[in-house]
């Protein structure tokens, strides 16, 4: 895969992932009422990071925001923070990567500057994706813990006034936002890795520059017309491109593993 293609694909994948992270953060269905093995109620509860909602069988849906900061569980605050960090880093990553794209010419920006920016954006996307994945996983862990706690309460007869009145505890299970978040985080991470791979293809080899300084005098060029080109690599773009493409391809083959994030 060419450097431009790898960089472009990395950018697009990260962009899709970033959009998914925003969508997941805004979604109301982080946790949804568990309907399995539960008394069937005519209301359906679901909760997001910012508000909780109730949908009645009449179709009427009412959502209430969490209008408190101090009263919210620390874990929920942490998840919010992780998702926001993911979004902020994603925004910066996108802005940086736009300027870093090889297909976009901005002033007299050389390849080494673009390489640095590509690497920066790649790292930002990687951290953004990891941040989202951690955020979603923390929330999922919180749900699992609460689910089994409420299940234990449900079957140990703790609900109600001394067992006289049955109180049904609403159990919550994974909502759609968790799966969106995991996939989105994974895509952002993969896109970031692709950007980092593309950066290697954009970076001119340091040894080539050293060769230029050793053969700076004009007489060397006169005596060894092909030597200068061969040693610097400036005349051997095709060969170098092949090496970089080979590197990119090999890295891509190794990077087939991170797609496991799509299925977490």
């Amino acid at each position: 895969m060419s450097v431009t293609a790898c960089q472009g694909l990395g950018f697009v994948v990260s962009l899709i992932g970033f959009a998914g992270i925003i969508a997941a953060t805004c979604m109301d269905q982080w946790s949804t009422q568990d309907l399995y093995n539960n008394p069937v109620t005519a209301v359906f509860n679901y909760q997001g990071l910012w508000r909780s909602c109730v949908r009645e069988s009449s179709g009427f849906t009412e959502c209430r925001g969490y209008f408190t900061l101090l009263g919210l569980p620390a874990m929920l605050q942490a998840v919010r923070a992780l998702m926001i960090v993911g979004i902020v880093l994603g925004v910066i990553g996108i802005l940086v990567s736009i300027f870093a794209l090889k297909c976009i010419r901005i002033g007299s920006m050389d390849d080494s500057a673009k390489a640095k920016m590509t690497l920066t954006s790649g790292i930002l996307f990687i951290i953004s994706g990891i941040s989202a994945i951690i955020g979603v996983s923390v929330f999922a862990n919180m749900l699992v813990t609460n689910f089994w706690m409420s299940t234990a309460n449900m079957y140990s007869g703790m609900g109600g006034m001394g067992g006289m009145v049955q109180t049904v505890q609403t159990r919550y299970t994974f909502g759609a936002a968790l799966f969106v978040g995991w996939v989105a985080g994974g895509l952002t991470l993969i896109g970031g890795v692709m950007m980092c791979i593309a950066c290697r293809g954009l970076t001119p080899d340091d040894s080539n520059f050293k060769a230029v300084s050793y053969h700076a005098s004009g007489q060397n060029v006169a005596y060894r017309p092909g030597g200068f080109k061969a040693s610097t690599g400036f005349g051997s773009n095709t060969r170098n491109k092949k090496i970089y493409d080979g590197g990119a391809r090999t890295e891509d083959d190794e990077q087939s593993h991170p797609t496991k994030y799509d299925y977490v």
Epitope: P39, V40, T41, A42, V43, V54, S57, S58, V165, Q166
Partner: antibody
Framework: EVRLQQSGPELVKPGASVKMSCKAS????????MHWVKQSHGKSPEWVGY????????GYNQKFKGKATLTVNKSSSTANMELRSLTSEDSAVYYC???????????WGQGTLVTVSA | DVVMTQSPSSLTVTAGEKVTMSCKSS????????????LTWYQQKPGQPPKLLIY???TRESGVPDRFTGSGSGTDFTLTISSVQAEDLAVYFC?????????FGSGTKLEIK
Amino acid sequence: EVRLQQSGPELVKPGASVKMSCKASGYSFTDYNMHWVKQSHGKSPEWVGYINPNKGGTGYNQKFKGKATLTVNKSSSTANMELRSLTSEDSAVYYCARIWYGNSFAYWGQGTLVTVSA
Amino acid sequence: DVVMTQSPSSLTVTAGEKVTMSCKSSQSLLNSGNQKNYLTWYQQKPGQPPKLLIYWASTRESGVPDRFTGSGSGTDFTLTISSVQAEDLAVYFCQNDYFYPFTFGSGTKLEIK
């Protein structure tokens, strides 16, 4: 104005079946579930079940499973309930009712009186 | 199924009097998601379908006189008529709107002296 117009009274023999209708007007028929309620003379109402006019999905009170079948005709904005294998226990007024906030029944049909008699 | 128990079964009052009737459910009708109680009160006059008075245990349906007030939470609910009028002669039913199957109470018959 929301209106639920039910079909007229029915006198049927034991073991027979009866099908009653409920024509809705004044609102978008497919937007709200239609519920059916049975009320025997001098007794409290009993919820029979509901039908989602949009998807056709139904939910029944276990007591009426196999007894009642709910259907809809979207084109005529009509909900139907068929009762089969009728006995004297099935003699009652049957109401269709449209759900509202709090899952309450704000709109009711005038009722269909079903009398099962030999 | 959720059992709804209403008391008293009948009440005889004079016009202008304050009336309270009770409804108890075998399971809590409080939804934790919105802190609302899914209990409805209906008024049924002879030969008519029930008429919605109160939903969410305390929210008065539009057009219902403000002398009708619903209160309570969880399993214990009350319908209060602050000043009974002659036209309030009817049977009052409470209904569980939270669990399927929806269930009604046996009713409280209000009679005027």
